[in-house]
């Protein structure tokens, strides 16, 4: 199933090599290419606890870890200026909109119960604004905002209970939405969730330093999406005929020498390490890669002969995260003394390789600019022509079967551990005004203009 | 090449705590691809894992032991060490400690083992 | 009582073939790696076979070992005085967090 990845390094003559009449190609995307942009909810929707909506662990890691952010009250506001957003969506030309539904505004507590209406009412809104305007939503059920509650009470995806929990939530969702929604993510790059969340401390809920407690949390990530595909495929693509999949985020590298093995076997392992972790089970063979069975064998859960069975094969696509939050900081272990690379191209060979060409939705990538920048974004402009003219490459060239983009973001907002230092926005957005206007960067104007022309014009 | 070397006392009174240091050549405790390891065999008997411990300060013990293992690294004198709380008689065996290995590519498994000291819990 | 079972003993003659089973679960041979380690009289252990089948520098081919789903296999052809040992087969168990090791088996060469 899996190790071809490794012939990207070694410049396996199948490999188109990038010369110097394909440092930037002239050309259009395929016929309809699924061009989108992408919010999450915590990122963009401020009103924290407004309208009954229950705090989620980011919520509480804000106000104990983020000592100068004093909440996302502030953030963008979507949860208020919907409209707003619809606007720039319009104004964008996008084929669909990837955005997140906050569980605790459904679920204040995270337990399937009686939705909060509010709620309800806003993501239903949202859904049908997007199937008016001929946006096709692509919704992801967890993008990190996990009702405190269910942390308190459980320790969060640390204990399998949740799995079964998040399904309840999933369920819920496929019926509510699921007449609108053809395109599904369960979640959004697990690696980051417990790489950050449970390893280095740096995102929700902060703990750290256990590596057991890190695996664990990836293996019930794991079993979680398997749990919502199965749960799909079974109750509701039948009548939905929709897609589902996992958003698995990486980073890049390169050999300190490139053509030394022992560096080209690092640089295997460091993408096993992050990004064949989850896609293994998932898009491969149904287990861990053997490389980190054998060297994580005392922290790493394993799978039963059943649960490979079940893990295999539940993602309808692959969709694929490459930007900042997989580069800064990377972890030691991941790098493993060779360089980091931002050649998305690359990666996009490697994952045709490693999983057996599977069709992928780049469903985050972009770049971030400093909070002081407002609308004259040109490092972004630069990071996205560069980042597009790696995937046209992939597709033309190597023939890789990438069908749809995700620009990140829409819309400044919250970043993470980053707080509002930087901004990933196409739209602009002053915090500390009261209307929350969306300005549209030069990104904005130029990303228009990509999807108006299908790529790049001579 | 690597070698280890256990020390400690051979006489141990019962409900005392057994405590014993191996002491590292040929490679350095604080290495990622190594778990620092103990493990005894009583007169006559198989061998039975204690415990071991990883460079970054984790640890595992074999579970019907934990409650009287402790398993630490001394980077500054490349040591380890394993202490052994409220012994009795069936604690008597002798005492090897281990590099324990895996790394991406193959799992050694105990690689490398001392010579063993043997310790006797008697008044 | 071992989490690995071992036959207690095996015999034969010089020159003849030999194995010995160890047979575990899924949680420990079926989803882990298996050494195998020599134990002469009156000596420490030692590494005769890693990651199921694979042999360290100096030690000669005539050992070899297997696994299949929650059993693995050492066996030794061609054998020699100098075998006569004790053979303990070793992985990780996933359920106990623990190195577990089989209970041993004598070899007798006859």
């Known amino acids: 199933f899996s190790g071809d990845g490794r012939a990207i390094w070694s410049k396996n003559p199948n490999f188109t090599p990038v010369n110097e009449s394909q440092l930037f190609l002239y050309d259009t995307f395929p016929k309809n290419f699924f061009w989108g942009i992408g919010t999450g909810a915590l990122q963009v929707e401020g009103s924290w606890k407004k309208d009954g909506k229950g705090p989620s662990i980011w919520d509480h890691f804000i106000h104990t870890h983020l000592k100068n952010v004093s909440s996302t009250n502030g953030s963008s506001d979507s949860y208020i200026f919907l409209e707003k957003d619809l606007s720039a969506l319009d104004f964008i030309g996008v084929s669909f909109y990837q955005f997140s539904i906050s569980w605790p505004r459904l679920f204040p507590d995270g337990i399937v119960t009686v939705a909060n209406a509010k709620g309800l009412q806003y993501y239903s809104t949202l859904l049908d604004a997007l199937v008016l305007r001929n946006i096709e939503p692509i919704v992801t059920l967890y993008h990190w905002d996990l009702p405190l509650a269910l942390q308190e009470k459980y320790g969060g995806w640390k204990n399998d209970t949740i799995i079964d929990i998040f399904n309840d939530y999933a369920t819920y969702c496929f019926q509510m939405f699921g007449d609108r929604v053809k395109y599904w993510i369960t979640i959004h790059n697990p690696y980051l969730v417990a790489w950050h969340g449970y390893g280095t401390g740096m995102h929700a809920p902060g703990e750290k330093g256990n590596l057991a407690a890190v695996y664990t949390v990836g293996h019930n990530l794991i079993k979680a999406h398997s749990k919502v595909w199965h749960n799909y495929n079974t109750h509701f693509r039948p009548h939905q005929k929709g897609w589902l999949s996992i958003t698995l985020g990486s980073h890049w590298i390169e050999p300190n020498r490139s053509e030394n093995t022992m560096d080209i076997f690092k640089c295997q392992q460091s993408m096993v390490s992050v990004l064949g972790w989850f896609a293994n089970p998932i898009h491969g063979d149904g287990d861990y890669p053997e490389g980190m069975r054998k060297k994580l064998f005392s922290v790493l859960p394993i799978f039963s002969e059943a649960e490979k069975h079940e893990m295999r094969g539940t993602a309808d696509f692959f969709a694929f995260s490459f930007g900042p939050n997989n580069f800064k900081p990377l972890n030691t272990m991941a790098k493993m003394g060779q360089n980091v690379s931002l050649n998305l191209r690359e990666a996009l060979n490697w994952i045709k390789l490693e999983y057996n060409n599977p069709r992928i939705l780049i469903a985050e990538n972009g770049w971030f600019t400093d909070s002081r920048v407002k609308t004259e974004d040109t490092t972004a402009i630069y990071m996205m022509k560069n980042f597009l003219s790696q995937v046209l490459q992939a597709i033309r060239l190597d023939e890789i079967r990438v069908f749809g983009y995700t620009a990140w973001s829409l819309l400044d907002g919250f970043e993470w551990q980053d707080a509002y230092t930087i901004r990933r926005g196409l739209f602009y957005v002053d915090f500390n005004s009261k209307q929350k206007e969306r300005k549209p960067k030069s990104s904005a104007h130029y990303y228009k203009q990509i999807i108006r022309e299908n790529g790049f014009s001579l | 090449q690597v070698q280890l070397q256990e020390s400690g006392p051979g006489l141990v009174k019962p409900s005392e705590t057994l405590s014993l240091t191996c002491t590292v050549s040929?490679?350095?405790?604080?290495?990622?691809?190594?778990?620092w390891s103990w493990i005894r065999q009583p007169p006559g008997k198989g061998l039975e894992w204690i415990g071991f411990m990883f460079y970054s300060g984790s640890t595992n013990y074999n579970p019907s032991l934990k409650s009287r293992v402790t398993i630490s690294l001394h980077t500054s004198k490349n040591q380890f060490s394993l202490r052994l709380s409220s012994v009795t008689a069936a604690d008597t065996a002798v005492y090897y400690c281990?590099?324990?290995?895996?790394?991406?590519?193959?799992?050694?498994?105990?690689?490398?083992w001392g010579q063993g000291t043997t310790v006797t819990v008697s008044s | 009582q071992s989490v690995l079972t071992q036959p207690p003993s095996v015999s034969a003659a010089p020159g003849q073939k030999v194995t010995i089973s160890c047979s575990g679960s899924s949680s420990n041979i079926g989803n882990n790696y298996v050494s195998w380690y020599q134990q002469l009289p009156g000596t420490a252990p030692k590494l005769l076979i890693y990651?199921?089948?694979k042999r360290p520098s100096g030690i000669p081919d005539r050992f070899s070992g297997s696994k299949s789903g929650t059993s693995a296999t050492l066996g030794i052809t061609g054998l020699q005085t100098e075998d006569e040992a004790d053979y303990y087969c070793?992985?990780?168990?996933?359920?106990?967090?623990?190195?577990?090791f089989g209970g041993g088996t004598k070899l007798t060469v006859l």
């Open positions: 990651d199921n089948n």
């Open positions: 070793g992985t990780w168990d996933s359920s106990l967090s623990a190195v577990v």
């Open positions: 281990g590099r324990y290995r895996s790394d991406w590519d193959y799992y050694y498994g105990m690689d490398v």
């Open positions: 040929g490679d350095s405790v604080s290495s990622g691809d190594n778990y």
